[in-house]
C-alpha cells in the first residue's frame, strides 16, 4: 500500500507539473471582482462602490474561455481526489498575496471550493485552504 | 464617514525613536491590509510599509528594514509604526492607507510630520 | 526591487486640452492572474494622495471618465481627455506586484 501511495504521490506531482492553472487563477479573480463590482465590496464604504464596475470585467466572455480552460486542466485531476486538492492549494497558494482582504480571501476561498462543481467534476470532500492571511511575505 | 487619523509626529534628534499611530473609523480596519506611505519634503511618494489583516505578514521598504516595525491593534481599531534610529533622511509627512483588497491604497488619512533633526 | 520611471516629470497644461503621463516600469507588472499590479494616484496640493486608477485600467469609484489608464507589461499610459483646473497637482504611478513602489511623480501645473 505505501509503494502505492508513493507512486500516487509522484504521478499527482508530475500531473501538477504538467497542469496550468493560470486560467482557473484568472478566472477566479475575474469572477470575485464581477461580483464585487455587481454588489458592492465595501459595507462601510461611503454611498458609492469603492471601485466602479470594469467593462472588461462586466463582458464576462474573457471569463469564461478562462473557464473553460480551468476545467480542461482540472479534468486531469478526476480520478485522484487527493491530486485535485493539491492543485486547490496551489492556486490559493498561488495568489494568496494578490488578495490583501479578509472578504476578498473568503470569497476566493469559497470559487475555489465550487471550482470542482462548476466544471462538472467531483469536488474533493476534505480539502484545507487556509493560507495566512493577508497573503505570504514573499519578498 | 471614513476616517484615518494620524498622530505622534513631531520634531526629533537623529538616533532617537518615535512611535505613529492612526486611529481607524467608518472603515473595516480589521479587514484589510493597512500601509504607511511617506512624502519627504520636494520629494514623491515613499512606500513604507505594510501590515496583513491578521498581523502575520509584514512588508518593508528596504531604506526602513530593520529600523522600522509596523503593527496594528484590533481591539483598538489603531495601526502603529514603531520607528527606531530615525535619520535626517526620515523626516516627512507619514500617511497611514487601508488597501482596497486587491493591492491597491484605497482610503488615506491626512498624514502626520516627521522632522529628524539636530 | 521594481523601479518605476515617469515622464514628463513636469507637464504644463492648457483647461481643455488633452494630457498624458507616461509610466514604464523595469519589469513585467503582469501577474500569473492575468492583471497589471499598476496604480495611478494623484496628490492635489493640501491634500492627502487618492487612487484613480488601479490595475492599469480600472477606474475607481467618484474617479470623473476624463481619467484613463492603459498598458501593460512595462509601459502604462495615464490620459486626461480634458484637462480642468482641479487636476492640477503630482500624479504618481505605483506598482504592487512586489510589495510597493511609487514612480518620482510628474507635477501638473496650468499654463
Known amino acids: 500500500r505505501q509503494q502505492w501511495e508513493l507512486q500516487g504521490d509522484r504521478r499527482c506531482q508530475s500531473q501538477l507539473e504538467r497542469a496550468n492553472l493560470r486560467p482557473c487563477e484568472q478566472h477566479l479573480m475575474q469572477k470575485i471582482q464581477r461580483d464585487e463590482d455587481s454588489y458592492g465590496r465595501d459595507p462601510y464604504s461611503p454611498s458609492q462602490d469603492p471601485y466602479s464596475p470594469s467593462p472588461y470585467d462586466r463582458r464576462g466572455a474573457g471569463s469564461s474561455q478562462h473557464q473553460e480552460r480551468c476545467c480542461n486542466e482540472l479534468n486531469e485531476f478526476e480520478n485522484n481526489q487527493r491530486c485535485m486538492c493539491e492543485a486547490l492549494q496551489q492556486i490559493m497558494e498561488n495568489q494568496s498575496d494578490r488578495l490583501q482582504g479578509r472578504q476578498q480571501e473568503q470569497q476566493f476561498k469559497r470559487e475555489l471550493r465550487n471550482l470542482p462543481q462548476q466544471c462538472g467534476l467531483r469536488a474533493p470532500q476534505r480539502c484545507d485552504l487556509e493560507v495566512e492571511s493577508g497573503g505570504r511575505d514573499r519578498y | 464617514q471614513v476616517q484615518l487619523v494620524e498622530s505622534g509626529g513631531g520634531v526629533v534628534q537623529p538616533g532617537r525613536s518615535l512611535r505613529l499611530s492612526c486611529a481607524a473609523s467608518g472603515i473595516a480596519f480589521n479587514d484589510y491590509t493597512m500601509h504607511w506611505v511617506r512624502r519627504a519634503p520636494g520629494k514623491g511618494l515613499e512606500w513604507v510599509a505594510a501590515i496583513s489583516y491578521g498581523g502575520t505578514n509584514k512588508y518593508y521598504a528596504d531604506s526602513v528594514k530593520g529600523r522600522f516595525t509596523i503593527s496594528r491593534d484590533s481591539s483598538k481599531n489603531t495601526l502603529y509604526l514603531q520607528m527606531n534610529s530615525l535619520r535626517a533622511e526620515d523626516t516627512a509627512v507619514y500617511y497611514c492607507?487601508?488597501?482596497?483588497?486587491?493591492?491597491?491604497?484605497?482610503?488615506w488619512g491626512q498624514g502626520t510630520l516627521v522632522t529628524v533633526s539636530s | 526591487e521594481i523601479v518605476l520611471t515617469q515622464s514628463p516629470l513636469s507637464l504644463p497644461v492648457t483647461p481643455g486640452e488633452p494630457a498624458s503621463i507616461s509610466c514604464r516600469s523595469s519589469q513585467s507588472l503582469v501577474h500569473r492572474n492575468g492583471y497589471n499590479y499598476l496604480d495611478w494616484y494623484l496628490q492635489k496640493p493640501g491634500q492627502s494622495p487618492q487612487l484613480l486608477i488601479y490595475?492599469?485600467?480600472k477606474r475607481a469609484s467618484g474617479v470623473p471618465d476624463r481619467f484613463s489608464g492603459s498598458g501593460s507589461g512595462t509601459e502604462f499610459t495615464l490620459k486626461i481627455s480634458r484637462v480642468e483646473a482641479e487636476d492640477v497637482g503630482i500624479y504618481y504611478c505605483m506598482q504592487a506586484l512586489q510589495t510597493w513602489t511609487f514612480g518620482q511623480g510628474t507635477k501638473v501645473e496650468v499654463n
Open positions: 490595475m492599469a485600467s
Open positions: 492607507a487601508r488597501d482596497s483588497g486587491y493591492r491597491s491604497l484605497l482610503h
